[in-house]
Every structure is written in structure tokens, then in C-alpha cells.
Amino acid sequence: CPTSCKCSSARIWCTEPSPGIVAFPRLEPNSVDPENITEILIANQKRLEIINEDDVEAYVGLRNLTIVDSGLKFVAYKAFLKNSNLRHINFTRNKLTSLSRRHFRHLDLSDLILTGNPFTCSCDIMWLKTLQETKSSPDTQDLYCLNESSKNMPLANLQIPNCGLPSARLAAPNLTVEEGKSVTLSCSVGGDPLPTLYWDVGNLVSKHMNETSHTQGSLRITNISSDDSGKQISCVAENLVGEDQDSVNLTVHFAPTITFLESPTSDHHWCIPFTVRGNPKPALQWFYNGAILNESKYICTKIHVTNHTEYHGCLQLDNPTHMNNGDYTLMAKNEYGKDERQISAHFMGRPGVDYETNPNYPEVLYEDWTTPTDIGDTTNKSNEIPSTDVADQSNREH
């Protein structure tokens, strides 16, 4: 454990003033694994003045960082870059004169407590005023800053000329694009202090490159992948005070593909499971032994899960018999193309010939996760498939 501190497997605390610490506590090699540390408590450490860029990076599991009644004057911009789990930061009663939002912008903080610090009234801390104004009143802190006359001024009253939130405006064409094509987005930003412009493309798969010059920026996306349909692209303007963003959703149109089609499985009903991708939503058509399959109450397509441009479902059959054995073909079609796949289904042997009523198909259960949704409502009464109801149909509830 670092000198002057105590440790457990998940916690480090350095609270005794004497002799105290002069640097952020670091674990010795071959001691506790720093990744397991979730809380660091530092108090009464008047000679601890700096958190360097690499001081905290080993504590990737850190959730709570408390440094109170100490001498903290400076925190490096990238000090918490690797600490994405940080939720609570308490820097009460230290010697901080300034603190940038750049320290914390990538963190999802529940608490940032900064009372009792001698902040200098400047644009650098205007973001704290903005943060206070957006928080609900029970959470607000009494933050003060020292003005030019070295008088304590409530942060709520802070007025700094030419110090405001930036703005971002995205001039995007219709962002519905065909797979394989390219598109260029333009963005302009403004504000004082002059903001920087950057693009947040998330986990965009398609190749992209950006150009930025002062307050203008462009993002070119080439050979657009269908995997990027539904993704959000944001233009972000950021300055000392805060950030603004303008976003668009990318819609990619592409021909359908049947990515999964398997032999029937039995649960409450028999199910021929399938997965289809396509945008716009493909129309689905089933064929039985080469002829169009007329869907009915007893044989119908059910979509269980829709994941943006991907549809997971079943051709559902009620009590199929040997009469329903055969080749089933699924065709998915939209204006960009079509795809089809076939499987052979064996539900039951012929009576008197084959008494095997439960063939060795894998018993994979297929859950109805959502209300079934029919897509591709196509029936053709002229090519009827034998009904799966071989019992007395008058007993059915219609």
C-alpha cells in the first residue's frame, strides 16, 4: 500500500495529516491489483497539490474519488481519461483556482462536488455555472469565485463578456443513401470563445474522412455499408463553456439478404426460423414445393424481433402432418433486389408406413419476444398448401 495510506482489496484511504502524502497514491507492483480499486479517499493531505496525467490511469475500475481538505491545485487534462467508471468526484475544500470541463466531458458523473475551492472568476469556470443551472435545485452547490478585487462572488452571479455556449449547425442532404454510395455532410459552428469542431461518428463502419477549417467542417462517408443504417452522426462544437451538437440519422437502403433459414423446430407451434436483412422493409413470400404458399390462420409468418433493418421470425405451422412435409422457400424482396433460400421440412411420417412422430430435429425453443408482426402479407388462393389441421375442422374456433 502507498506510504501513509491504508488499503483493502477495493479501497485506498489516505486520511491522516501526518506525515501525509505529496503525490497521488500508487500501488506497489505485486500488491493489490489496481483494476480492483473502486474507491480512493484522500483527506487532510495539504501537500498533495497535483494529479498528473498518469496518476489515476491504473485504477480503471475506480468509481468514487474523494480528495477533501487537501492542497489540490492542479489536475492534468487527461488525468481521468482511462477512468470511464468514475461516477462520484468530490474535491471539496482544496486549492483549485480553475478546472476545465475537458477533465470530465467523457465521464458519466453522478456527482462533481467542488465547494470550498478558491476559483478565479474567469471564462474557464463558466461551464460550472452552466452545469449548476442545468441541475435540479437539491443538487446545487454554493460555489464561489474570487473576482479582480479578491472578493468572493457567487458563481450564480458570474457574468463574463464574450463567454458563452457554442452552437453547431449541420447542413446535411437527405441522409437516405443506397449501399455502396457516398455522401458529404457539412457543419458550421460558432460562439465566443471560438469553438473547436469535431465529428462524433460513434462506431461507423463505413470509410470516412473529415476536413475542418475554423468554423466550417465537412465529413465525407464513402462506400456506405448497410451495417451503418440507423446510426447517428453528430457535429460537435466545443469551447471552455460547454458544447453543442447537431445530429442526423443515417438511413441506408439495400437489397434483402436471408442470413438464416433452418429446419423446423417444435415448441408451442412448429417453426421454420429465419432472419432477413433489408431496407426498406422487404416483402416476404413463402413457396411450398415451388408453388406460392397461401398463408392462413394455421400457417403464417410471424416476426418476433425487429432490430432496425433485421427481422427475426418464423413460418409458424399449427399441428403439421406428413402432408406438410416438403421444400419450403423463402423469398425476400424490396425495390433494391431480392434473395431466396430453401430448406426441406419433415414433420411426420406417413400413417401406416412410418410411425415416427418425432423426428430428430434439434429442439430449439423460439421465444415470442414481441407482439408478432406480419410483414409481406402475400397470399395466393390458387396454390393452396394442404391445411395443417387434419382433425375435425369444425372444432376450430374461428
Epitope: K6, T15, E16, S18, P19, G20, V22, A43, R47
Partner: antibody, heavy 118, light 108 residues
Framework: QVQLVQSGAEVKKPGESLKISCKGF????????IGWVRQMPGKGLEWMGI????????RYSPSFQGQVTISADKSITTAYLQWSSLKASDTAMYYC???????????WGQGTMVTVSS | QAGLTQPPSVSVSPGQTASITCSGE??????VSWYQQKPGQSPVLVIY???KRPSGVPERFSGSNSGNTATLNISGTQPMDEADYYC???????????FGTGTKLTVL
Amino acid sequence: QVQLVQSGAEVKKPGESLKISCKGFGYSFTNYWIGWVRQMPGKGLEWMGIIYPGDSDTRYSPSFQGQVTISADKSITTAYLQWSSLKASDTAMYYCASHTKDGTWDIWGQGTMVTVSS
Amino acid sequence: QAGLTQPPSVSVSPGQTASITCSGERLGDKYVSWYQQKPGQSPVLVIYQDDKRPSGVPERFSGSNSGNTATLNISGTQPMDEADYYCQAWDSSTSLYVFGTGTKLTVL
């Protein structure tokens, strides 16, 4: 040489005020806490409070809060313990203590005997 | 932390090991220091941070701390070790240090 030198013995009457001192030599007085410890005749040691001369952050033991005032003047590397109205029960030896970067309260003054009697 | 409890007195023959205990709730979570005070003198630090010895303190002084108890051991005790011994720890509830009740060590 690192040392703390305390002011001399005091004999006072109840109700009188008093301020005793503790001057630091040979170390960075501003950057290390100073503490005051009471020892009544024939009794054990009791922490009264501590002060950080660099910013005058002061902590008092609950039993001494409001009874005494601890202060420091970093410009002359001196800490103080004062009473506004002494009582007979304040009769005791008072020690100041500080620490170096490695030790915990490893520097002690020689003590100041305060006698309060009518 | 309500306080630190020490035995009022411990007796030991010269050359033997003297053990003085200090008890307090979750004391192992705090650092413990030990002070020696001879009659008419200021206290002297003999152990800090549970088991560290300041320079000039003989090796026969050692310390340990775990659970609810800290211990000061003096091996090969000498007549010059006869004194009052106080443990000390940080009390986070009051943000101040607290001394133990003190133990008088007698070397028979």
C-alpha cells in the same frame, strides 16, 4: 537542527487570559501540521487540536472546541494556544508537536507548564 | 472511535519481551503510533505507521497492528525502557488524533 521551542511557564489567576507560543526551527514550518497536547498532573496525554500553518486550517478535539483558540503566524514560524478566561482545571503541561515528511509527530516542544490558581 | 484502551501497567524482567496492547474499533484500518514518555520529559516517538521505527530508536522496539488491536513489543527489555507508553491513532469521526489511555512499563 529541527526543533520546537515553547514559551516559558505561566502562573495565572482564574478568569485571566493567556497565549502561549511554539516556534519552529530548521524545517518548512508552513508545510507541516502543528498540534497541541495537554497533560494534566499525573494523567495521560490528550490531543487538543491541530493547525496547518500554510492555510490556517484548524481542527479541535470536541472537548476543547470553544475552550481554546489555536492559531499560527507562518511569517515568524510560530504557533499559538490561547485562553480568553482560564480555569483552575486548565492547570497542566502543554506540549506542541509537529512532524517531518517521514515521521508522525516526531518533533516535540519541551512543554509549557501553566498553573491556574487563585 | 470512542477511544483507545491500554492496560494501565505491564511488568517485565530485564532481558524479557514486554508486550503492550492498544485496542480500538477497527484499529487495523488506521495507522498506530507509539510514544515513550519518561517522568518530567516530553514524549518521544518510538513507532509510527504501525511498524516503522524512527532513526535513533533501538531495534528492540517493534510494532504490529491488525483487526482491533495494535501491539508494541520491546524485546530484551532494559531498565532504561521503564516509562509510560501511549498509542495514538487518527479518529476520522472527529478529524483528529486520539491517544490511548497509557501504560506504565515497569522493569523488575
